[in-house]
Interface confidence: medium
């Protein structure tokens, strides 16, 4: 059985479309599971992995390796 584009698995009932945009940053493995691109995490691979050591409480990032501080916090790790 040959599955349609973006369909995977037995019965072709698993759907996965690789994407690299606001809504996700992932490839699809041979089973149709999402595999996050480097620097991204989460079930939809849309959460950037911040700079190592970035305070999870006072820092965040839109892009991998970044560390943006909340108002009132500063430093390389927003700590």
């Amino acid at each position: 059985v040959t599955c349609d584009d973006y369909y995977y698995g037995f019965g072709c009932n698993k759907f996965c479309r690789p994407r690299d945009d606001f809504f996700g940053h992932y490839a699809c493995d041979q089973n149709g599971n999402k595999t996050c691109m480097e620097g991204w995490m989460g079930p939809e691979c849309n959460r950037a992995i911040c700079r190592q050591g970035c305070s999870p409480k006072h820092g965040s990032c839109k892009l991998p390796g970044d560390c943006r501080c909340q108002y009132g916090w500063q430093g390389l790790y927003c700590d």
Epitope: F15, R17, D21, F22, E44, N46, R47, K62, D66
Partner: antibody, heavy 119, light 107 residues
């Protein structure tokens, strides 16, 4: 279970702003973007934009660019949609909505917030 | 931006009828299409995603088909609770636009 609970109805004057909240529960708030969709009385559905609560990245429909601001507070698992320079055509029910676990469509919806713009 | 054209805009049918609603995208959306049902005063409810996959707890009388730019929602045998407004929506690229809706009324 996933729940999205929105703030109550608002009546606003033309030219003013409105800020609608959407409190999420039943999942990890930062794992999924939150979207906003509106529906004018008797009209269809209109996608306005979305936010990635983890990092704060946003995407907006061009129609609303510059007039809508979507934000998120990770500490309270709450998303906000602020619409400025209100006009009568902005009278609508505003919904927050979230995707399902392994697909893109909106499987989870808030109950809707009616915003009435009237002088 | 991809535009979604839904037809018909309204439809009268009877309980037991087979009903078809179509949605045409202005570009290839590669099956990234959903169908929703909405009743007055309620939020939309997801019926079908990825063009043909039934959402949880949706009755099997609902089915979706299509590819490329043309998609169809079929209700094989209308039940009283199916009278509502139906919307398609694409998820290929932002903005994720909806079709104009099809109001399904009792004949």
């Amino acid at each position: 279970q996933v729940q999205l609970v929105q703030s109550g109805a608002e009546v606003k004057k033309p030219g003013s702003s409105v800020k609608v909240s959407c409190k999420a529960s039943g999942y990890t708030f930062t794992d999924y973007e939150m979207h906003w969709v509106r529906q004018a009385p008797g009209q269809g559905l209109e996608w306005m934009g979305a936010i990635q609560p983890g990092g704060g990245g946003t995407a907006y429909a061009q129609k609303f660019q510059g007039r809508v601001t979507i934000t998120a507070d990770k500490s309270t698992s709450t998303a906000y949609m602020e619409l400025s320079s209100l006009r009568s055509e902005d009278t609508a029910v505003y919904y927050c909505t979230r995707r399902g676990y392994d697909d893109y469509p909106f499987a989870y919806w808030g109950q809707g917030t009616l915003v009435t713009v009237s002088s | 931006d991809i535009q979604m054209t839904q037809s018909p805009s309204s439809l009268s049918a009877s309980v037991g009828d087979r009903v078809t609603i179509t949605c045409r995208a202005s570009g290839n959306i590669h099956n990234y299409l959903a169908w929703y049902q909405q009743k007055p005063g309620k939020a939309p409810k997801l019926l079908i995603y990825n063009a043909k996959t039934l959402a949880d707890a949706v009755p099997s009388r609902f089915s979706g088909s299509g590819s490329g730019t043309d998609y169809t929602l079929t209700i094989s045998s209308l039940q009283p609770e199916d009278f509502a407004t139906y919307y398609c929506q694409h998820f290929w690229s932002a903005p994720w636009t909806f079709g104009g809706g099809t109001k399904l009324e009792i004949k």
